[in-house]
Interface confidence: low
């Protein structure tokens, strides 16, 4: 059919929940283009009807609510005006047994559900909720094992969790939730979240500091070959990871066909206090597909991305 | 839409039992918790029983624990409760409700009242 494959994306939900996958994939995505969303492979496009339990809201597949059997491949075609783009989502749902605890919880949690709070400080826990437009989230309630997080040391702030002097205590599951509208009626989002505990102070009060990439764009010709180091100082005992991600996957999987971009060795230089780690990022032909998509780099609880863009054109050629 | 329908509501005497259902169409409740409230005249609403995880989880307030069992059909559709043993001071009009929190404090025991949807009720009197 003349599209290119561009990557898997792998979703594990919840049953009951409502649940939205935007298909975004800039720089593409970013022009004049049209999508449309397909189930395992159909010809039939998903219904763009807004009172259908699955439709189509502009560029996002909205499920009101998932529902058992809606486990699956999804495709988003993405056609531009010479081009034509195809993601592919793999949605995995569950029954999740919020309350009963003799019942397994949430099985391979991405990094959305599992979130870290430092001891002894002021940290906070986000409640990752990604809607389209039609969407209304009410207030979000957070819960600690079933139980309305409630007490001074706990802040409610827009979509976080605010936890001031935080104990070993607080590590357990939370969940939020929130009452999502949509067209008049009314749906419970839950997301549950496994909290731990870490005791390292870190090295500059921070852990860990990534010292590059600083969240910046880098500009870079089409078909070059571009390596770029993403550099961090942690505490000489640490056990955090050092990656490099696009779309919440791991380069080396997102890429595994290909291989076209890969994350290089880690390195590491010991100094007194601190370690200095460097693990790079190799883009061994920088293709259109590139640009404007953020290339993150990953070190514990910290993040730093890079975003390549074309060099602006050199009228003085001409 | 969203509908609760209950029935199976009457009057019994002391000792009797009664079982009611919910037909609940126009919404999935595979996560969610459904249950029964209560509310008497010029009393306040009272949370009787509610059923969640696909009836792994149940929750009972002591006023009718041991006397009153909720359950659910297959298809998650119907909620039941049956009412035995009963006794004057379960004279209430009894709604079901759905689209709770099953994390909220209604589905296990609490006082909160976290539904998104509720029936029109269904009136128990127990009474010689």
């Known amino acids: 059919d003349g599209c290119k494959d561009i990557f898997m994306k792998n979703e594990i939900l919840s049953a009951s929940q409502p649940f939205a996958f935007n298909c975004t994939f800039p720089p593409i995505t970013s022009g004049e283009v049209s999508v449309t969303w397909y189930k395992n492979s159909s010809k039939i496009p998903v219904s763009k009807i807004i009172q259908s339990r699955i439709h189509q809201d502009e560029t996002w597949i909205l499920f009101l609510p998932m529902e058992w059997g809606d486990s699956g491949v999804y495709q988003c075609v993405i056609k531009g005006r010479d081009s034509c783009h195809r993601i592919h989502v793999n949605l995995t749902v569950f029954e999740k047994h919020w309350c009963d605890t003799s019942i397994g919880g949430l099985p391979n949690l991405s990094d959305e559900y599992k979130q870290i709070l430092h001891l002894g400080k002021d940290d906070s826990l986000t409640c990752h909720l990604h809607f389209p437009k039609s969407c209304v989230l009410g207030p979000i309630k957070w819960y600690k094992d079933c139980n309305e997080i409630k007490g001074e040391r706990f802040t409610v702030l827009e979509t976080r969790l605010l936890v001031s002097n935080v104990s070993a205590e607080d590590r357990g599951n939370y969940a939020c939730q929130a009452i999502l509208t949509h067209s008049g009626k009314q749906y419970e989002v839950l997301n549950g979240i496994t909290v731990s505990i870490t005791e390292r102070a870190g090295y500059g009060g921070s852990v860990p500091k990534i010292i590059y990439p600083k969240n910046h764009s880098i500009e870079v010709q089409l078909g070059t070959t571009l390596i770029v180091d993403c550099n961090v100082t942690d505490t000489k005992d640490n056990t955090n990871l050092r990656c490099w991600r696009v779309n919440n996957t791991l380069v080396d999987d997102y890429y595994d066909e290909s291989k076209r971009i890969r994350e290089g060795v880690e390195t590491h230089v010991s100094f007194r206090e601190h370690n200095l780690y460097t693990v790079n990022i190799t883009f061994l032909e920088v293709k259109m597909e590139d640009y404007g998509l953020p290339f993150m780099c990953h070190a514990g609880v910290s993040t730093a991305y890079i975003i390549l863009q074309l060099p602006a054109p050199d009228f003085r050629a001409y | 839409d969203v509908q609760l329908v209950e029935s199976g509501g009457g009057s019994v005497q002391p000792g009797g039992s009664l079982r009611l259902s919910c037909a609940a169409s126009g919404y999935s409740y595979r996560t969610q918790c459904l249950g029964w409230y209560r509310q008497a005249p010029g009393k306040q609403r009272e949370a009787v029983a509610t059923?969640?995880?696909?009836?792994?989880?149940?929750y009972y307030s002591d006023s009718v624990k041991g006397r009153f069992t909720i359950s659910q059909d297959n298809a998650r559709t119907t909620v039941y409760l049956s009412l035995t043993s009963l006794k004057p001071e379960d004279t209430a009009t009894y709604y079901c409700a759905a689209g709770l929190s099953v994390l909220g404090s209604w589905c296990h025991g609490g006082s909160s009242y976290e539904y998104t949807y509720s029936g029109q009720g269904t009136q128990v009197t127990v009474s010689s």
């Open positions: 059923i969640s995880g696909g009836g792994t989880s149940t």
